[in-house]
C-alpha cells in the first residue's frame, strides 16, 4: 500500500518535500515515478538511479529517500503530485498528493511606503 | 513525429575511432521518459546493443564494448554521438539510433529507429 | 548475460499460413522487458510487441506475443507477403546487461 499526506502546503518562493511511502512484505520497488498532473517531474529506477526532467531540473532534487524536494515554489505549482511505485510482484500502486502554495507570509505583511 | 537521422563517416581505418552522430527531430532529446542508444549490426549478422544515454548525460554501456565506446549528448542541438575506440575489421557494422525506453518499465523497447548507416573498417 | 536462443533459425511458409517463433531465455526475463521486432533487407528494425505481449502502434492483430519466465512465443496468424523477414526478441534488462536473440528468418516456401 501507498501512504501519504494528502494535503501538504508551503509558501512561495519556499520548498516543500513530496513523499510517498510503500510498504509491503514481499514485493521490491523498481521504480518510482513522480509527476505533476501529467508532467513527468522525476524517475527513481533501481537499475539506473534518479532522472529528473530537465523542465525542473533547476527546481527538483532528489530525495530524501525515494521523495522529492521541490524548491523556489511558485503558485504555479499549486495541484495535484501523483508517485507512482513500480513493483515486482506485486504491480504498480499510485499515491496522490495535494499541494497547496500560499503567498509569502513576508509579502503578506509588508507595510505599504509612507506618502 | 519523432525521426532520427544517423550521420558519419562511412570508412574508418583500423585502430582509429570511429565517430557517429544522431539528430533528433520532431522531439525533444530532453523528453524525460526516454534514453537514447545505439545499436549496430555485423553484415549478415544479429543485433547489437552498444550503449545508451539519457539527456542529463546518464549512461549505461554494454559491458562488451564499455572499455571502448563513448556515449555523450548535446542537447542544444538535439543530437547524441558515439565514438568507438581502437576499432577492427570486426567493428564493420550497419549503425542505428534508437529511442530507448528503458524508464518506461512496462514497455521497455526500442520503439524508434533511423534508419542506419554502414561503416566499414578498413585500410 | 542473457542469452536469447531462437529457433528455428529459418522458418519456410506459404501465404495464409501461421507462424509460430520461439525465443528462450537462458535465465528468467520479466515479461515486461521482452520485445519482439522485425527487420526487412536493407531496413532498420521495426518494433511489433513490448512487454511480451502488447502491440506497438501500428501493428496489425494478426502478430502477437505470449510467454512468461524464459519461454516467449511470437505468432503470426495468417502471414500476409509483407511479413515474410526476420524477427528478433531482445531482453530489456539493465543488469546483466540487455541482449538480443539471434533472429528467425520467415521465408517463403
Known amino acids: 500500500t501507498i501512504d501519504t499526506k494528502r494535503n501538504i502546503s508551503a509558501e512561495e518562493g519556499g520548498s516543500v518535500i513530496l513523499q510517498c511511502h510503500f510498504s509491503s512484505d514481499t514485493a521490491e520497488v523498481t521504480q518510482v515515478d513522480w509527476k505533476q498532473q501529467d508532467q513527468l517531474l522525476a524517475i527513481y529506477s533501481v537499475d539506473l538511479g534518479w532522472h529528473v526532467a530537465s523542465v525542473f531540473s533547476d527546481r527538483v532534487v532528489p530525495g530524501p529517500s525515494l521523495g522529492l524536494t521541490f524548491q523556489s515554489l511558485t503558485m504555479n505549482d499549486t495541484g495535484e503530485y501523483f508517485c507512482t511505485y513500480h513493483t515486482y510482484p506485486g504491480g504498480i500502486y499510485k499515491g496522490r498528493i495535494f499541494l497547496k502554495v500560499q503567498e509569502s507570509s513576508v509579502a503578506q505583511f509588508q507595510t505599504a511606503p509612507l506618502g | 513525429q519523432v525521426q532520427l537521422q544517423e550521420s558519419g563517416p562511412g570508412l574508418v581505418k583500423p585502430s582509429q575511432t570511429l565517430s557517429l552522430t544522431c539528430t533528433v527531430s520532431g522531439g525533444s532529446i530532453e523528453s524525460g521518459l526516454y534514453y537514447w542508444g545505439w545499436i549496430r549490426q555485423p553484415p549478415g549478422k544479429g543485433l547489437e546493443w552498444i550503449g545508451s544515454i539519457y539527456y542529463s548525460g546518464s549512461t549505461y554501456y554494454n559491458p562488451s564494448l564499455k572499455s571502448r565506446a563513448t556515449i555523450s549528448v548535446d542537447t542544444s542541438k538535439n543530437q547524441f554521438s558515439l565514438k568507438l575506440s581502437s576499432v577492427t575489421a570486426a567493428d564493420t557494422a550497419v549503425y542505428y539510433c534508437a529511442r530507448d525506453g528503458v524508464l518506461a518499465l512496462n514497455k521497455r523497447s526500442f520503439d524508434i529507429w533511423g534508419q542506419g548507416t554502414m561503416v566499414t573498417v578498413s585500410s | 548475460e542473457i542469452v536469447l536462443t531462437q529457433s528455428p533459425g529459418t522458418l519456410s511458409l506459404s501465404p495464409g499460413e501461421r507462424a509460430t517463433l520461439s525465443c528462450r531465455a537462458s535465465?528468467?526475463?520479466?515479461?515486461?522487458?521482452l520485445a519482439w521486432y522485425q527487420q526487412k533487407p536493407g531496413q532498420a528494425p521495426r518494433l511489433l510487441i513490448y512487454g511480451a505481449s502488447s502491440r506497438a502502434t501500428g501493428i496489425p492483430d494478426r502478430f502477437s506475443g505470449s510467454g512468461s519466465g524464459t519461454d516467449f512465443t511470437l505468432t503470426i496468424s495468417r502471414l500476409e507477403p509483407e511479413d515474410f523477414a526476420v524477427y528478433y526478441c531482445?531482453?530489456?534488462?539493465?543488469?546483466?546487461?540487455?541482449?538480443f536473440g539471434g533472429g528467425t528468418k520467415v521465408e517463403i516456401k
Open positions: 535465465q528468467s526475463v520479466s515479461s515486461s522487458y
Open positions: 531482445q531482453q530489456h534488462t539493465v543488469r546483466p546487461p540487455l541482449t
